[in-house]
């Protein structure tokens, strides 16, 4: 470090360290003056600052601090946006899988069905994304919705395919009759369990990490009081009008400035750490019907099993169906 | 049991070592995730010595500045002269979070609220009684696990293999037929929850 | 540990050229705005050129303005000072400075000073 400067009788050296912040010298005085206007940088005797100074001196202060704390927050900001992306889009992937999956199994196992399975699978696991992405739609309503679209194509094709499919007058009995006969036994319900609590825990998740984002960029924009300015610049720039071009703050006098700039943001504190424990008995809770990629790539095989249900029991159900369904499907007949 | 093409199937006995260990699943990039964001948990409690620590401080120098004038590093008027006859260090902190800090503040209140009432204990057993009708769930050991029921195979464990990461620019065909998969074959009344999720390639 | 080496000092006649190097390292160069400074003989420091890190933005005291030129390579770790036109008051120990996050506050780091005289 260079030797210590003798007394300046002018303000030189002052000027051209201003200069660094501010280009042109009108601000600076050209020797030292009382500065019985300063409201920050006190003098003791004469001083090289202006009240302008100050003025910049407190401006550069603040926009330091906003600087320092996004630099401080990069790290973070950088792992939460880039997991909140890749989760959101692998959760997409699985459904699209899983979508997929119960499509190749009906092309496979129920030819007859495709077309019309296919547009209900679609829908389904649609409504599925959607839920994920925060949309307020029912999970026990898109489980219903699939099998009670589902029950009238299965009835008309695979249980009785001589039946014309035409009018809509049997299909809605037809969807009446799949909740009140329990048609497929409890496949509906099971799934509704499974869907919900794997659906609820990953939205909440993927809510969680844009909430993390939020936190992080709240704080990373927030705007330092005036207060927080002048301590800042009593730390930082008031040595300069004394002349004193090399010394730095004391390391505790920093700790204190901060301590009081931050006493706001430090509050969060609380809530961060328990925000992070939280998440962390969360996921640590994601595994079996709590994992949405375990539950919705295994739908596939719950509804074949849920088909067959219906196949095994077609006998009395047809027959139940008849008598039920029956004024429906007179009018069809005629 | 669905059908599936004869390429895609594969013998219940190879499904043993038909996953790589070291795959990525969505499950431990979770976990993954939450080890790195503990390293943050102190974040903002440790702000302003990260702060001090980024912005120049008298480290090796003899002398340093408190706010008034040039003091001795290790003096007691290291840290307090600068703050005297200044406004009150006391005051700025009474004054409260700012509006927007609070605001997040609620936010994480809330949500911290949303995820413990969603927080399972771990190695709960999957509900039972989910039906009247005496449907249950298996459970099978370990975390990552999950349980296929063969009709009278017993418990064939399986590694949950959706290799999300190198799958994030993959899309699969709907001629795809589930790979790797054995079905589940629910007994009369029964029915095996998990299935395996297949080598998706 | 971060250290700065000035080198290129020395006696020039009036009007005459220097280039004055830096050579830094213990930190990442590229990313650090740097400054020189100087200190005439019995007299107190004077700023005299800044330069971001990227060398994209560069500033100067008025009375080196047209006359010296900040510069750096960052894949050398090296700023430079190259200083046209001398006079007699340009003679000083000029040091390199690491800027620190706070822009215009007190630099982090200094180098030992290399030493320039301008005489006839």
């Known amino acids: 470090q260079p030797p210590p400067p003798p007394p300046d009788a002018t303000c030189h050296q002052v000027r051209s360290f201003f200069q660094r912040l501010q280009p042109g010298l009108k601000w600076v005085p050209e020797t030292p003056v009382p500065g019985s206007d300063l409201q920050v940088c006190l003098p003791k005797g004469p001083t090289c600052c202006s009240r302008k100074m100050e003025e910049k001196y407190q401006l550069t202060a603040r926009l330091n601090m906003e600087q320092l704390l996004q630099s401080a927050s990069m790290e973070l900001k950088f792992l939460i946006i880039q997991n909140a992306a890749v989760f959101q889009e692998a959760f997409e992937i699985v459904v699209r899988h899983a979508k997929n999956y119960t499509n190749a199994m009906f092309k496979n196992n129920y030819p007859s069905l495709t077309p019309q399975a296919f547009e209900f699978v679609g829908e389904f696991f649609t409504d599925v994304s959607l839920y994920i992405l925060g949309s307020d739609i029912n999970v026990d309503d898109m489980v219903n919705e699939l099998f009670d679209s589902l029950f009238p194509v299965i009835y008309t094709q695979l249980m009785n395919p001589g039946l014309p499919d035409s009018a809509l007058d049997i299909n809605e009995c037809l969807r009446g009759a799949r909740r009140d006969l329990k048609v497929f036994g409890n496949f509906p319900k099971l799934i509704m369990t499974q869907v919900s609590k794997s659906l609820q825990v990953t939205r909440i998740f993927l809510q969680a990490l844009n909430l993390g984002i939020e936190v992080i960029n709240t704080t990373d924009h927030l705007k330092f009081s005036k207060d927080c300015g002048r301590m800042l610049t009593r730390m930082w720039y008031c040595s300069y009008c004394q002349g004193l071009m090399m010394v730095k703050p004391c390391g505790g006098y920093c700790n204190v400035v901060m301590q009081g700039c931050m006493a706001g943001v430090v509050e969060i504190d609380k809530y961060w750490r328990e925000y992070i424990l939280s998440l962390e008995e969360l996921v640590n809770g994601m595994y079996r019907i709590y994992d949405m990629e375990n539950v919705l790539l295994g739908l596939f095989s719950t509804i074949h099993d849920s088909i067959q249900y219906v196949q095994k029991n077609a006998g009395k159900l047809t027959t139940t169906i008849g008598k039920l369904c029956a004024h429906s499907q007179q009018r069809q007949y005629r | 049991s669905a059908y599936y093409p004869e390429d895609l199937f594969i013998d219940k006995k190879v499904l043993k070592v038909a996953h790589v260990e070291h795959e990525e699943t969505l499950s431990s990039r979770r976990r993954e995730l939450i080890q790195k964001l503990k390293s943050f948990i102190s974040f903002y409690s440790a702000l302003p010595g990260y702060i001090c620590s980024h912005s120049p401080v008298a480290e090796n120098d003899t002398l340093c500045w408190n706010g008034q004038e040039l003091v001795e590093r290790y003096s007691q008027k290291a840290a307090r002269n600068g703050m005297k006859n200044q406004f009150n260090l006391h005051e700025l902190k009474m004054k409260g979070p700012e509006p927007v800090v609070s605001q997040i503040i609620d936010k994480l209140k809330h949500i911290n609220q949303l995820l413990r009432t969603m927080s399972m204990p771990k190695g709960r057993v999957l509900d039972k009684n989910l039906d009247e009708e005496g449907f249950e769930s298996g459970d099978c050991g370990d975390d990552e696990d999950e349980c296929i029921g063969g009709s009278g195979d017993g418990m064939i464990k399986v590694k949950n293999q959706l290799r999300f990461l190198a799958e994030l620019a993959y899309d699969l065909d709907v001629d795809d037929a589930p790979g790797n998969s054995q079905q589940a074959t629910p007994k009369d009344n029964e029915i095996s929850t998990f299935h395996n999720l297949g080598n998706v390639h | 540990e971060v250290q700065l080496v000035e080198s290129g000092g020395g006696l020039v006649q009036p009007g005459g050229s220097l280039r004055l190097s830096c050579a830094a390292s213990?930190?990442?160069?590229?990313?650090?705005?740097m400054s020189w400074v100087r200190q005439a003989p019995g007299k107190g420091l004077e700023w005299v050129s800044a330069?971001?890190?990227?060398?994209?933005?560069?500033n100067y005291v008025d009375s080196v303005k047209g006359r010296f030129t900040v510069s750096r390579d960052n894949s050398k770790n090296t700023l430079y000072l190259q200083m046209n036109r001398l006079r007699a008051e340009d003679t000083a120990v000029y040091y390199c400075?690491?800027?620190?996050?706070?822009?215009?506050?007190?630099?982090?780091?200094w180098g030992q000073g290399t030493t320039v005289t301008v005489s006839s």
């Open positions: 330069i971001s890190g990227s060398g994209g933005s560069t």
């Open positions: 213990g930190f990442t160069f590229s990313s650090s705005a």
């Open positions: 400075a690491k800027e620190s996050m706070v822009r215009g506050g007190p630099f982090d780091y």
